[in-house]
């Protein structure tokens, strides 16, 4: 029961995380104009991974896409790549984890396969979360560097008479969304991996009680292999699986005619 809960919770947390990563990637507020030196501006600038926007006090907002690939900074391209990789891995992970969920029965899928799929999706979520966190952190680092560089040349004068205020950018909402979302995906992935570890032993214990006589005792070796004691070794010619300690009788989830022979 705890394993199912852990797996389900891991899936939900990862789902929220990946939705957040997608949202962050699409958001325009990766960097927003720093208003510290010019709090009375009537024009507000903010930038995303795909376009930059200008919002005027009047409410009119104009956004322009970055219609160039070669002209963009390498760091921005790297951040885009990390976020897309994170989304793709997360999406695949979600797809895999849906089939791996204990509460969902698909055909004659073995629990060992479900355990492996849970582990696979968990790893995918972890990598996805790390990609998002890395992408957002790289962008944040880029902002900090540019912020202090622009602060150094904040004012460029023409004979000291005319001032040109250079626009500085600070952390936008998308960065915080990305960090939180990446963290959630990472946590969800860890939960899936933990669920995978507990998936097989719980399965075997439950099945052993349901399929054997009450006097039949089942012992577990630390390695996770089943060792039968009592009525002889493997009396019903049941195949022992290394991965999930499962029997041929247990392949199908619903009762079949073989269960009653």
């Amino acid at each position: 029961m705890a394993v199912t809960a852990c797996q389900g919770l891991g899936f939900v947390v990862s789902l929220i995380g990946i939705a957040g990563i997608i949202a962050a990637t699409c958001m325009d507020q990766w960097s927003t104009q720093d208003l510290y030196n010019n709090p009375v501006t009537a024009v507000f600038n903010y930038q995303g991974l795909w376009r930059s926007c200008v919002r005027e006090s009047s409410g009119f907002t104009e956004c322009r896409g970055y219609f160039t690939l070669l002209g963009l900074p390498a760091m921005l391209q790297a951040v885009r790549a990390l976020m897309i990789v994170g989304i793709v891995l997360g999406a695949i992970g979600l797809l895999v984890s849906i089939f791996a969920l204990k509460c969902i029965r698909i055909g004659s899928m073995e629990d060992s396969a479900k355990a492996n799929m849970t582990l696979t999706s968990g790893i995918m979520f972890i990598v996805s979360g790390l990609c998002a966190i890395a992408g957002v952190s790289v962008f944040a680092n880029m902002l900090v560097t540019n912020f202090w560089m622009s602060t150094a040349n904040m004012y460029t004068g023409m004979g000291g008479m005319v001032q040109t205020v250079q626009t500085r950018y600070t952390f936008g909402a998308a960065l915080f969304v990305g960090w939180v979302a990446g963290g959630l995906t990472l946590i969800g992935g860890v939960m899936m991996c933990i669920a995978c570890r507990g998936l097989a032993p719980e399965e075997t214990n439950y099945k052993a009680v349901s399929y054997h006589a009450s006097g039949h005792s089942v012992a577990y070796k630390p390695g996770g292999f089943k060792a039968s004691t009592g009525f002889g070794s493997n009396t019903k010619n049941k195949k022992i699986y290394d991965g999930g300690a499962r029997t041929e009788d247990e392949v199908q989830s619903y009762p079949s005619k073989h269960d009653y022979v």
């Epitope: 104009q33 501006t41 024009v43 903010y46 005027e56 009047s58 409410g59 205020v165 626009t167």
Partner: antibody, heavy 117, light 113 residues
């Protein structure tokens, strides 16, 4: 059709308060802002302040202590209140609607205010 | 506050003449985000409220004749009337719409010779 119309007292005594109402039609005050501009007789334009659709306000730094702008969205009315009037506050007061680039594309006809005892 | 300086304060012209007036700001009105200059030009005819001519320093308001041209960037701006008409005899104001307060220039008065 966008229209703005100012209505004021005409004559105000020094040290008193001035209240002007701008009634708008053809657009919503929840979406668009209203700027106030005045023009002393024979002189240039002076921007006083603005109230935006979201209710946020900005005032001219020289008038911030005695100027307030408010609005009633449901009645499509914007109010300007200027306290402690002096003779140099004598002017024609205009309300205007800003849009693209914060430029004012529609103006009222203005209301003339004289500060005199 | 951004100070707007207009020159000349008055211009005496004849109908059909080309006219140029200047507006300088104490700070740059160029927004790096969209590379637009937040400067506006108005025309005020005697006894009338001002009317918008040009925004973003060079974009003509709809209905404004194409004889009006705005140019310039950063701190130096120009309004050009290619062929002055009788109805153009008015006072022309530039306005900073980039930073509060949204200050006006003192105006350039266009008079008939």
């Amino acid at each position: 059709q966008v229209q703005l119309k100012e209505s004021g007292p005409g004559l105000v005594a020094p040290s008193q308060s001035l209240s002007i109402t701008c009634i708008v039609s053809g657009f919503s005050l929840t979406t668009y802002g209203i700027s106030w501009v005045r023009q002393p007789p024979g002189k240039g334009l002076e921007w006083l302040g603005v109230i935006w659709g979201d209710g946020s306000t900005h005032y001219h730094s020289a008038l911030i202590s005695r100027l307030s702008i408010s609005k009633d969205n449901s009645k499509s009315q914007v109010f300007l209140k200027l306290n402690s009037l002096q003779t140099d506050d004598t002017a024609t007061y205009y309300c205007a609607k800003p849009y693209y680039s914060n430029a004012m594309d529609y103006w009222g006809q203005g209301t003339s205010v004289t500060v005199s005892s | 506050d951004i100070v707007m300086t207009q020159s000349p304060s008055s211009l005496t012209v004849t109908v059909g003449e080309k006219v140029t007036m200047s507006c300088k700001s104490s700070q740059s009105l160029l927004n790096s985000g969209n590379q637009k200059n937040y400067l506006t030009w108005y025309r005020q005819k005697p006894g009338q409220p001002p009317e918008l001519l040009i925004y973003w320093a060079s974009t003509r308001e709809s209905g404004v004749p194409d004889r009006f041209t705005g140019s310039g960037s950063g701190t130096d701006f120009t309004l050009t009337i290619s062929s002055v008409q009788a109805e153009d005899l008015a006072v022309y104001y530039c306005q900073n719409v980039y930073s509060y307060p949204l200050t006006f220039g003192a105006g350039t008065k266009l008079e008939l010779k």
